[in-house]
């Protein structure tokens, strides 16, 4: 089935430069590898900036979005750009930095229930056609008041892991990103290699939970590289703990 080809873990344990929480320590889920390009630009600095090509926002880091670098530029040439801060113009939620969302074309501050601010509200910002086909995943439009004060539960649409309740992370599933459970000890994970083929990942698992890392299962050491089973295992040492 497609599932066997596409199923994978694509979160914390990616080695640079393919991403992972190392580049964005505040992010529970790293950039989701995309069909066209794997990973996102995880080491963007003013002094050493290397544009990272992308097809969707989710291929970029938590503090980035995917767009043409020039206004009205060629939609076929898209890179990961730094997110827009408060009061900057936007066209979609993913363009705004964490802690903000796009409302009426402007990045505005949000509390932890940020994506509830769109209740029954149509935002139809128009900036011409730039970015019109580059839109990524939005925080959930919560249309039910019962969910107004709760973070995303399992299966809820999300943009970032901060949209999800504790113990969950935001990961790709089919054509959306949803809140899924963080992996527990013994659960299967996939540790991507630097030059691995991530092109078809549309099913993602969360990262391994705190105190765990994605490692080859001991009794699978003799297996061929392609069939090595990775599971979430306890750290032998106390470094690299991950906080949700």
């Amino acid at each position: 089935t497609l599932n066997s080809v596409l199923n994978s873990n694509a979160i914390k344990n990616l080695p640079p430069p393919l991403g992972g929480a190392a580049g964005h320590p505040g992010s529970a889920v790293s950039a989701a590898p995309g069909i066209l390009y794997p990973g996102g630009n995880k080491y963007q600095t003013i002094d050493n900036y290397q544009p990272y090509p992308c097809a969707e926002d989710e291929e970029c880091g938590t503090d980035e979005y995917c767009a043409s670098p020039t206004r009205g530029g060629d939609a076929g040439v898209q890179i990961c750009l730094a997110c827009r801060k408060r009061r900057k113009r936007c066209m979609r939620h993913a363009m705004c930095c964490p802690g903000n969302y796009c409302k009426n074309g402007i990045c505005v501050s949000s509390d932890q229930n940020h994506f509830r601010g769109e209740i029954e509200e149509t935002i139809t910002e128009s900036f011409g056609n730039d970015h019109s086909t580059l839109d990524g995943y939005s925080r959930r439009t919560t249309l039910s008041s019962k969910m107004y004060h709760t973070k995303g539960q399992e299966g809820s649409v999300c943009l970032r892991s901060s949209d999800c309740a504790s113990g969950l992370c935001c990961a790709r599933h089919f054509w959306s990103k949803i809140c899924k459970p963080v992996l527990k000890e013994g659960q299967v994970c996939t540790k991507h290699r630097r030059k691995g083929s991530h092109g078809l990942e549309i099913f993602q698992r969360c990262y391994c939970g705190e105190g765990l890392s994605c490692r080859i299962q001991k009794d699978h050491h003799q297996a061929s590289n392609s069939s090595r089973l990775h599971t979430c295992q306890r750290h032998h040492h106390h470094h690299h703990h991950h906080h949700h």
């Epitope: 995943y137 299966g155 089919f174």
Partner: antibody, heavy 117, light 111 residues
């Protein structure tokens, strides 16, 4: 209020083409995935195509190569270009989106496509 | 693809009675710690409406009398006390694998 309104259905001969549209309102269209689901007369539901917020497309084998899903975020619109139509494509076509969870949680009222000679 | 089989095909009940609808998958629809099973209600001439997702979570604005349960391959939709407006066709749908597939439906009719 979330609204999805389909249009473009009609009668077409086998082998013909038709383009369906779905006008969306009440949510930030450009940020969400959206899909087409169809229902043949007196039958169950069948997924037809989906497109992610960023424009990635997905199809079942039954329509791959014949149908093309696309979106125009500037117009808050979804489209389904249907070519090489067959009698078995006769159905009510719904656009549906996933705003709150991964399931199809909001649906339009549908547009009817009849393929017959 | 995952095949979903719903039973019974038709359920004849009276208002106020309890309805129990079954959906069986040809393989497990559990993954990532979630049961990717959804339930929809459809009335004649209308679009489907999401009732339950992730096996047991209620969709927005869905009355509490609708509940879902199950995991793996066997799932149940329960309507605790049928209201007149609940007589309709109910479909299960899996989202574990592409393509997403639907069951054949269960018609709940007035006895």
């Amino acid at each position: 209020e979330v609204q999805l309104v389909e249009s473009g259905g009609g009668l077409v001969q086998p082998g013909g083409s038709l383009r369906l549209s779905c006008a969306a309102s009440g949510f930030t269209f450009s940020s969400y995935a959206i899909s087409w689901v169809r229902q043949a007369p007196g039958k169950g539901l069948e997924w037809v195509a989906s497109v992610s917020g960023g424009g990635r497309t997905y199809y079942p084998d039954s329509v791959k190569g014949r149908f093309t899903i696309s979106r125009d975020n500037a117009k808050n619109s979804l489209y389904l270009q249907m070519n090489s139509l067959r009698a078995e494509d006769t159905a009510v076509y719904y656009c549906a989106t996933s705003l709150e969870n991964y399931a199809f949680d909001y649906w339009g009222q549908g547009t009817t496509v009849t393929v017959s000679s | 693809e995952i095949v979903l089989t719903q039973s019974p095909a038709t359920l004849s009940l009276s208002p106020g009675e309890r309805a129990t609808l079954s959906c069986r998958a040809s393989e497990s629809v559990d993954d990532f710690g979630i049961s990717f099973m959804n339930w929809y209600q459809q009335k004649p001439g209308q679009a489907p409406r999401l009732l339950i997702y992730a096996a047991s979570k209620q969709g927005s604005g869905i009355p509490a009398r609708f509940s879902g349960s199950g995991s793996g391959t066997d799932f149940t939709l329960t309507i605790s006390s049928l209201e007149p407006e609940d007589f309709a066709v109910y479909y299960c749908q899996q989202s574990k694998e592409l393509p997403p597939t639907f069951g054949g439906g269960t018609k709940v009719e007035i006895k």
